[in-house]
């Protein structure tokens, strides 16, 4: 599942990390838009292994793995992408 | 306010089952991130991570412990268990119940319980 | 497993003291890494989150460190309500593991 939202929260993530996660370990990503209380861009993403971390948003594979999702969510429904806006 | 309660047997005798509850409240175990777990702790010792529950039913166990745990859940009334099989001494300790949610920044075991004392004697 | 080695077990220090724990960790765990307070008879708490940063309300003379594969904690200045127990965890991956613990007392 990939998510975007738009938060008025502080940033999220104290560290960042570049190490590419293959596709078939990760459950969920969640994107936060740089603006509204943090400013700077931040990638979630959960693990199937109940572990989260932080993505470094310039990492070449996250970018690569980003491309593909918006694709895939504006051509078919298989990842739908949730937008939300929270006050 | 998020809160934890143990309760259990205060004593048992050795190759018995320990039973233990932990009721909460403050939030619910049916969100995506959300996790319930139990930790020891040996009186005047350190800290041992037992197991944890999460919301879509996974669960993890300390692997030195495994073949005597069960962790489980009723989500509907908030509530997490765990069962350890064929206790003897060692397994005198208090026992805290643990609140884990896959947030960033993540601080697992961010809320405990009180704890409650268990003593295996004959 | 990893194993996290936490010294000393005890200590005793006077009132304004800095005082220093440490960890060290036997595999990387990068800054997957908790220091708890336990206050006796209490249940612990989370006093430093991702090996450098302070919970919500703790005091500042409280600070985390971490130098490769070893962590500390530092009092800056020594308060009596700093009289507790210290335990690290790493969360790195399962199993979590903690620290023996350290028991802070007054000299």
């Known amino acids: 599942v990939l998510e975007v939202y738009y938060t008025s929260l502080r940033c999220r993530c104290v560290q960042e990390s570049s190490v590419f996660i293959p596709r078939r370990f990760i459950d969920r990503i969640q994107i936060l838009p740089r603006g509204n209380g943090c400013p700077r861009k931040e990638i979630i993403v959960w693990k199937k292994n109940k572990s989260i971390v932080c993505v470094d948003p310039q990492a070449e594979w996250i970018q690569r793995m980003m491309e593909v999702l918006r694709k895939r969510s504006s051509s078919t429904l298989p990842v739908p992408v949730f937008k939300r806006k929270i006050p | 306010q998020v809160t934890l309660k143990e309760s259990g047997p205060e004593i048992l005798q050795p190759s018995q089952t320990l039973s233990l509850t932990c009721t909460f409240s403050g939030f619910s175990l049916s969100p995506y991130g959300m996790g319930v777990g139990w930790i020891r702790q040996p009186s005047g010792k350190g800290l041992e991570w037992l197991a944890n529950i999460w919301w879509d039913d996974d669960k993890y166990y300390n692997p030195s412990l495994i073949n005597r745990l069960t962790i489980s859940k009723d989500t509907s009334n908030n509530q997490a268990f765990l069962k350890i099989t064929n206790v003897d001494t060692t397994d005198s300790a208090t026992y805290y119940c643990?609140?884990?949610?896959?947030?960033?920044?993540?601080?697992?075991?961010?809320?405990w319980g009180q704890g409650v004392m268990v003593t295996v004697s004959s | 497993d990893i194993q996290m080695t936490q010294s000393p077990s005890s200590m005793s220090a006077s009132l304004g003291d800095r005082v220093t724990i440490t960890c060290q960790a036997s595999?990387?765990?990068?800054?997957?890494l908790i220091w708890f307070q336990q206050k006796p008879g209490k249940s612990p708490r989370p006093l430093i989150y991702y090996a450098t940063n302070l919970a919500n309300g703790v005091p500042s003379r409280f600070s985390g460190r971490r130098s490769e594969s070893n962590y500390s904690l530092t009092i800056s200045s020594l308060e009596s309500e700093d009289m507790a127990d210290y335990h690290c965890l790493q969360f790195k991956q399962y199993p979590y593991t903690f620290g023996a613990g350290t028991k802070l007392e007054l000299k």
């Open positions: 643990v609140r884990s949610e896959l947030v960033m920044p993540y601080v697992p075991f961010d809320y």
């Open positions: 595999q990387d765990i990068g800054n997957d």
